[in-house]
Amino acid sequence: SAHLHPRDSCPLGPGRCCHLETVQATLEDLGWSDWVLSPRQLQLSMCVGECPHLYRSANTHALIKARLHGLQPDRVPAPCCVPSSYTPVVLMHRTDSGVSLQTYDDLVAQGCHCA
Amino acid sequence: SAHLHPRDSCPLGPGRCCHLETVQATLEDLGWSDWVLSPRQLQLSMCVGECPHLYRSANTHALIKARLHGLQPDRVPAPCCVPSSYTPVVLMHRTDSGVSLQTYDDLVAQGCHCA
């Protein structure tokens, strides 16, 4: 888009650029042990890594941001690695009336890009 | 959402946390002078600033990320300041057949949050 083309190969070396990584966390880690009953261990996919120039740019804004960061690094931050999509997660948790299964649509990342 | 509540007051002091800031850029800055004719100067609103714990969290994922960053700062990055919405921008640019007005929906940020 707009004469700036995002790229998908990482110039910093394997695993250094924006990518999805799974972090294991317990309910205690999240401070959820008082209301979530299951699962007691969560596989949390998160977006980590750097966003070098034009790498996995989310949109035109991210391409511009990358360009201006090169010109004014103190003023304009580099794009950063954030979720582009999410995987639904089913939690069994307490409710006022008992126990319920609920799907959360914005809890675990499925894909990442630089925004 | 999910027993973690985002907050809207910046604990780091005025202007330090994630907010919208306007950056002036010329077509030359953007490398667009060969195809955009107008405007020749763009007011580009961008998201800048830090994302301290629970500040302007985008969603449940961001709340979790903030929590896990506190527990594993080397493994899990802090949330970062990215656009939550965009303002459409009209550009006049060259085409093969002459000149055209086109609206870009993802060029200028309108709001920011921590993701």
Epitope: S38, P88, V89, M92 | -
Partner: antibody
Framework: QVQLQESGPGLVKPSQTLSLTCTVS??????????WTWIRQHPGKGLEWIGA???????YYNPSLKSRVTISVDTSKNQFSLKLSSVTAADTAVYYC???????????WGQGTLVTVSS | DIVMTQSPLSLPVTPGEPASISCRSS???????????LDWYLQKPGQSPQLLIY???NRASGVPDRFSGSGSGTDFTLKISRVEAEDVGVYYC?????????FGGGTKVEIK
């Protein structure tokens, strides 16, 4: 409505590898919190949990079978699979696939497939 | 592994009468969150098991309210307030507190 369907050979020779696939329909296999599970039932006997897999590929196995079991997932096909190596007659059973929340709440089950180990 | 023991092995019942099945675990299934990690399943003849009760006392979706689960720690009970002909089959308790989850040996409920 989620449905699970096991498929694979009904007869396996001793010392060979038993391979079964479970196809999930009516819902995505790519859901967090869900453990896609294999359970077996020896003829006329009770139920035994074999192991499970999360959409992310994380696996959980019964220690009594761990050295012989591999469970994998193919999110593109909405399937998960069981491989049990070095089978003996003691592995003859009806094999079920099921959906659980972690190790509990198996709310959807396949109809089961009988696998006989015999030469 | 946690050992689950069910009794009786077989339970002849009269339609319309109540029935009760016992399940005992070799260690407490009470989690620090106050819930007992125990499920009950019914396997009707020629069918796959179906979930009846989870977390000790919570009825699964679509399960008639004549089924109830109770108990805490190591002793649990599944009650059917008024048995119907369709309730025949083998009932299993299963501990879900720790891996591997383990099942009781089953209780066969049949009409007298």
């Amino acid at each position: 409505q989620v449905q699970l369907q096991e498929s694979g050979p009904g007869l396996v020779k001793p010392s060979q590898t038993l391979s079964l696939t479970c196809t999930v329909s009516g819902g995505s296999i790519s859901s967090g919190g869900i453990y896609w599970t294999w359970i077996r039932q020896h003829p006329g006997k009770g139920l035994e949990w074999i192991g499970a897999i999360a959409y992310s590929g994380s696996t959980y196995y019964n220690p009594s079978l761990k050295s012989r079991v591999t469970i994998s997932v193919d999110t593109s096909k909405n399937q998960f699979s069981l491989k049990l190596s070095s089978v003996t007659a003691a592995d003859t059973a009806v094999y079920y696939c099921a959906r659980g929340i972690e190790y509990q709440h198996f709310d959807y089950w396949g109809q089961g497939t009988l696998v006989t180990v015999s030469s | 592994d946690i050992v689950m023991t069910q009794s009786p092995l077989s339970l002849p019942v009269t339609p319309g009468e109540p029935a009760s099945i016992s399940c005992r675990s070799s260690q407490s299934l009470l989690h620090s969150n106050g819930y007992n990690y125990l499920d009950w399943y019914l396997q009707k003849p020629g069918q796959s098991p179906q979930l009846l009760i989870y977390l000790g006392s919570n009825r699964a979706s679509g399960v008639p309210d004549r089924f109830s689960g109770s108990g805490s720690g190591t002793d649990f009970t599944l009650k059917i307030s008024r048995v119907e002909a369709e309730d025949v089959g083998v009932y299993y308790c299963m501990q879900t507190l720790e891996a591997p989850p383990t099942f009781g040996g089953g209780t066969k409920v049949e009409i007298k």
